[in-house]
């Protein structure tokens, strides 16, 4: 029987060009974690395998950093990074536990108000 729960950073927002930490925490279970996958919609961002350590998908390696812990740091954010992110804990004997985070990437305040500072 699955007894665990996943706590996540929930719905978060960040500025374009900045960085954000995605965090999940599995609690209330004695299940052993064998692997954690980080996915964005249908794309794999990274894997943290209990034996092999971290693997970052080649298409994200310039903008994704492992950690802290089992979390994931996204850098050089763009508006296209807005969307759902999933932390997928693979465990035995419980099975899969999934946490969902929604990230909204906002235009930076400088970009929003840039017109005021333009020289005519």
């Amino acid at each position: 029987m699955m007894t665990g729960t996943i706590e996540t950073t929930g719905n978060i927002s960040a500025e374009k060009g900045g960085s954000i930490i995605l965090q999940c925490h599995l609690s209330s279970t004695t299940a052993q974690v064998t692997q954690v996958n980080w996915e964005q919609q249908d794309q794999l961002l990274a894997i943290c395998n209990a034996d092999l350590g971290w693997h970052i998908s080649p298409s994200f390696k310039d903008r994704v950093a492992p950690g802290p812990g089992l979390g994931l740091t996204l850098q050089s954010l763009t508006v296209n990074d807005t969307g759902e992110y999933f932390c997928i804990y693979h465990t035995y004997p419980d099975g899969t536990y999934t946490g969902r985070i929604f990230l909204e990437v906002l235009e930076s305040s400088v970009a929003e108000h840039g017109a005021r500072f333009q020289i005519p």
Epitope: Q35, N37, A50, Y92, T96
Partner: nanobody, 118 residues
Framework: EVQLVESGGGLVQAGGSLRLSCAAS????????MGWFRQAPGKEREFVGA????????YYADSVKGRFTISADNAKNTVYLQMNSLKPEDTAVYYC???????????WGQGTQVTVSS
């Protein structure tokens, strides 16, 4: 959802061996661990063992350690459960299971009957 097809069950005498196979319909980055569970008549389904696709690390319940071995053939998307020194108490329906996506828990096969006679 991952579709799983088991084979290899049957009737065997105590002390004998059987090998169960489980083929997965898909092989995606989400398919992390595959495992085996069993359910004896009147009992709850129990964990037998599992294997992680990436590391090929294996994990076993204490009751089968040293007797059962899980292995994987990545090319065939198939996992195996080699069962040696079988005992009558190993009699159960054996289910293949996979962790294949964002849904919680396991995806399950239909199960295959293993009967160990004394």
């Amino acid at each position: 959802e991952v579709q799983l097809v088991e084979s290899g069950g049957g009737l065997v005498q105590a002390g004998g061996s059987l090998r169960l196979s489980c083929a997965a319909s898909v092989r995606t980055f989400s398919l992390s661990d595959m495992g085996w569970f069993r359910q004896a008549p009147g009992k709850e389904r129990e964990f037998v063992g599992a294997i992680n696709w990436l590391s090929e690390s294996t994990y076993y319940a204490d009751s089968v350690k040293g007797r059962f071995t899980i292995s994987a053939d990545n090319a065939k998307n198939t996992v195996y459960l080699q069962m040696n020194s079988l005992k009558p108490e190993d009699t159960a329906v054996y289910y293949c299971a996979a962790q294949g996506g964002v849904l919680s828990g396991w995806d399950w096969g239909q199960g295959t009957q293993v009967t160990v006679s004394s």
